[in-house]
């Protein structure tokens, strides 16, 4: 039978590129079965996860799977970076895997590197 | 029982362009990683790279990069792989592979793999 | 990126006997998220890479218990109890941790 543990389904190394000044939203699949977990984001720096507290969030349910959704309006140049979220549930900290935002700045926007030019230089990315 | 359709094969002159495609019948391509893979006769696997079809967002090994580009159409649940400038040295079999996603994250399921022979 | 190097090149058994695999990655294959994304395949002559083991010792459904795999960080090791004639092919090993992914270069088992 199918597991009640809640699961945060962000793939593994998965990456976005966007561009600043557009809206953008990350999601964060979420499976439970009862109760709706608390859900949060966070941003990688170095080791740590520096809590999201001041964010616009929502939530979008699907027939088998909820999404929690950070959004972005707009994406500014130093959303750039990597981000998580978490869930708790039963007293358990469930984390996500991380997922990484490649922010283009809009100056630069004419000039846009492509996304396989950015995951294969990502020093690109503050041209 | 095969989840992997990839297309046929093919034969091209020097100097041309292939488009490969890798159609999954049993698994939402948005949920996971397509990987290309190829091999040339009598050697072994190498990784090209990999598409999120979710997003596009794309990954290559570098010694791919201008010679192969990863695309792939969600609404026909279908990846490509498109390779341009064809020499001799990119005569192989070509195969697609699907990554299992959530917890494992390894190359579960693969197509039957197409041959390219570039010959003039 | 990282170079995995697989030996025995080439491995010329007889049915019964056992048979071990080496896989050396030059950089760990452990991830951040204290997971080690090593996988065995096997290729039979004329067919597609099947996959035989991930997450370093797990194996896939419908792998018979004489494949085991083990180790850890940069070192792996592929072994089969007793090779039976369904053996025979090329075994890669993968990993699945750094970019670029990348392969090893192989090991033919044969059957004498």
């Known amino acids: 039978k199918e597991s009640c543990d809640v699961q945060l389904y962000i793939k593994r190394q998965s990456e976005h590129s966007i561009l600043a000044g557009d809206p953008f939203e990350l999601e964060c699949p979420v499976k439970y079965c009862a109760n709706r977990p608390h859900v949060t984001w966070c941003k990688l720096n170095g080791t740590t996860c520096v809590k999201l507290e001041d964010r616009q969030t929502s939530w979008k349910e699907e027939k088998n799977i909820s999404f929690f959704i950070l959004h972005f309006e707009p994406v500014l140049p130093n959303d750039n970076g990597s981000y998580r979220c978490s869930a708790n549930f039963q007293s358990n900290l469930i984390e996500s895997h991380s997922t990484t935002l490649y922010v283009t700045d809009v100056k630069s926007a004419s000039e846009r590197p492509s996304k396989d030019e950015m995951a294969s230089r990502p020093w690109l990315l503050y041209r | 029982e095969v989840q992997l359709q990839q297309s046929g094969a093919e034969l091209v002159k020097p100097g041309a362009s292939v488009k490969l495609s890798c159609t999954d019948s049993g698994f939402n391509i948005k949920d996971t990683y397509i990987h290309w893979v190829t091999q040339r006769p009598q050697q072994g696997l190498e990784w090209i790279g990999r598409?999120?079809?979710?997003?596009?967002?794309?990954r290559y090994d570098p010694k791919f990069q201008g010679k192969a580009t990863i695309t792939s159409d969600t609404s026909s649940n279908t990846a490509y792989l498109q390779l341009s400038s064809l020499t001799s040295e990119d005569t192989a079999v070509y195969y697609c592979?699907?990554?299992?996603?959530?917890?494992?994250?390894?190359?579960?399921?693969w197509g039957q793999g197409t041959s390219v022979t570039v010959s003039s | 990126d990282v170079v995995m190097t697989q030996s025995p090149l080439t491995l010329s058994l007889t049915i019964g006997q056992p048979a071990s695999i080496s896989c050396k990655s030059s950089?760990?294959?452990?991830?951040?998220?204290?997971?080690?994304?090593l996988n065995w395949f096997l290729q039979r002559p004329g067919q597609s890479p099947k996959r035989l083991i991930y997450?370093?010792?797990k194996l896939d459904s419908g792998v018979p218990d004489r494949f085991t795999g083990s180790g850890s960080g940069t070192d792996f090791t592929l072994k089969i109890s007793r090779v039976e004639a369904e053996d025979l092919g090329v075994y890669y090993c993968?990993?699945?941790?750094?970019?670029?992914?990348?392969f090893g270069g192989g090991t033919k088992l044969e059957i004498k």
């Open positions: 997450l370093v010792s």
């Open positions: 598409i999120d079809p979710a997003n596009g967002f794309t």
């Open positions: 950089q760990s294959l452990l991830d951040v998220d204290g997971k080690t994304y």
């Open positions: 592979a699907r990554e299992d996603g959530y917890p494992y994250y390894t190359l579960d399921c």
């Open positions: 993968w990993q699945g941790t750094h970019f670029p992914r990348t």
